[in-house]
């Protein structure tokens, strides 16, 4: 909501999760792994990489089925705490200028830092209008105090807020699982909010920094290395 059409394939780590229709976004973090939101879980997912217009075959797409879909063991469907999942692709993505991985964070998100949020979600705060072309939004990371004041009792240490307290610019339905990137690092995953782009109701995002060890451990545990003696 309140964003702009991204320059074509300018967000090469952005993926669309498809189950007969686009339902969530995600981020490519290595040639065979995608991170998304826990509440985007489905047992069968096709990951679509290299997308810009999700309704048109433009020639840069890679459609790869999920081989493994791993939701965080402490995901809470009511509070959306630990709203993160990992998808192992059935075959590695071909990395190129239009499809490439985003780095995991080396430090937690800092208030005031500019970030890029992207997705194919609803662009209206009242009503619905789902775009075909990838939308981008530049937005600042808010302080934890501002975040907690916006959602009293709802914000855990695994969440942070990004956006504008005045409203008008935000992620929305269909953006879940997608990236929040600051300084070339995946700081957030689109998670939840009360409505979209409402005053004093900024978007809430999963704090990826808290899950770097889980991500690395899960990838290691689900990668088959053949040792030749």
């Amino acid at each position: 909501v309140g964003g702009y059409i991204c320059e074509e394939n300018s967000v090469p780590y952005q993926v669309s999760l498809n189950s007969g229709y686009h339902f969530c976004g995600g981020s490519l973090i290595s040639e065979q792994w995608v991170v998304s939101a826990g509440h985007c879980y489905k047992s069968r997912i096709q990951v679509r990489l290299g997308e810009h217009n999700i309704e048109v075959l433009e020639g840069n797409e890679q459609f790869i089925n999920a081989a493994k879909i791993i939701r965080h063991p402490k995901y809470n469907s009511r509070t959306l705490d630990n709203d993160i999942l990992l998808i192992k692709l059935s075959s590695p993505a071909v990395i190129n200028s239009r499809v490439s991985a985003i780095s995991l964070p080396t430090a937690p998100p800092a208030a005031g830092t500019e970030s890029l949020i992207s997705g194919w979600g609803n662009t209206l705060s009242s009503g619905a209008d789902y775009p075909d072309e990838l939308q981008c939004l530049d937005a600042p990371v808010l302080s934890q105090a501002e975040c907690e004041a916006s959602y009293p009792g709802k914000i855990t240490n695994n969440m942070f807020c990004v956006g504008f307290l005045e409203g008008g610019k935000d992620s929305c339905q269909g953006d879940a699982g997608g990236p929040v990137v600051s300084n070339g690092e995946l700081q957030g995953i689109v998670s939840w909010g009360y409505g979209c782009a409402q005053k004093n109701r900024p978007g809430v995002y999963t704090k990826v920094y808290n899950y770097v060890d889980w991500i690395k451990d899960t990838i290691a545990a689900n990668s088959h290395h053949h040792h030749h003696h």
Epitope: G20, F23, A37, K42, S43, L80, Q173, W192
Partner: antibody, heavy 126, light 106 residues
């Protein structure tokens, strides 16, 4: 409180197009998604599709080639057209509203249907 | 398409009995499973959403449980007004209904 009322011809000839309208009263059509469901006599329920006032639609893949849904916000109505009907399309047709706004997660998903019309019987016969 | 298999297709129980209906999905649908009650000549009525959440105004004798592929709907103490057909419905990917379970009084 929101109420739904289906209307349309009770009899349609084979190969023709079935057309139904659902009128929403007691509330605005603008916020939720709106569905069509049908039920052949003595049988189970089959979801046909859903529409939003923006025109955003999802159709049952098995019926997709024959279904068109539209919405008229000025009249607080939404409509169903089902083309090339056969006797197998004879059923009670229901319109319904879903609980779109009960969750705050930002995925695209489907929702349970909490308000239904009373249904209208459509018979396909020559 | 996700197929929903409900059992039994019909049952007969006495007033006060505990009634259990099961629903099985052809693939994992997490908790995206709802239960409806339909009385003869009437539209379905939502009872339970997201597997276990009771819809507002629905009596507490109705409950639901399960996750993944296997779900259960329970009436803790059957009442005469509970005579109806009950349907499970998944909304994980598009929407499909189970075949229904007709509940009668002995």
């Amino acid at each position: 409180q929101v109420q739904l009322q289906e209307s349309g011809p009770g009899l349609v000839k084979p190969s023709e197009t079935l057309s139904l309208t659902c009128t929403v009263s007691g509330g605005s059509i603008s916020s939720n998604y709106w569905h069509w469901i049908r039920q052949p006599a003595g049988k189970g329920l089959e979801w046909i599709g859903r529409i939003h006032t923006s025109g955003s639609t999802f159709y049952n893949p098995s019926l997709k080639s024959r279904v068109t849904m539209s919405v008229d916000t000025s009249k607080n109505q939404f409509s169903l057209k089902l083309s090339s009907v056969t006797a197998a399309d004879t059923a009670v047709y229901y319109c319904a509203r879903d609980i779109t706004n009960y969750g705050s997660g930002k995925s695209i998903r489907f929702y349970p249907m909490d308000v239904w019309g009373q249904g209208t019987t459509v018979t396909v016969s020559s | 398409d996700i197929q929903m298999t409900q059992s039994p297709s019909s049952l007969s129980a006495s007033v006060g009995d505990r009634v259990t209906i099961t629903c099985q999905a052809s693939q994992d649908i997490s908790n995206y499973l709802n239960w409806y009650q339909q009385k003869p000549g009437k539209a379905p009525k939502l009872l339970i959403y997201d597997a276990s959440n009771l819809e507002t105004g629905v009596p507490s004798r109705f409950s639901g449980s399960g996750s993944g592929t296997d779900f259960t709907f329970t009436i803790s103490s059957l009442q005469p007004e509970d005579i109806a057909t009950y349907y499970c419905q998944q909304d994980d990917t598009f929407i499909t209904f189970g075949g229904g379970t007709k509940v009668e009084i002995k």
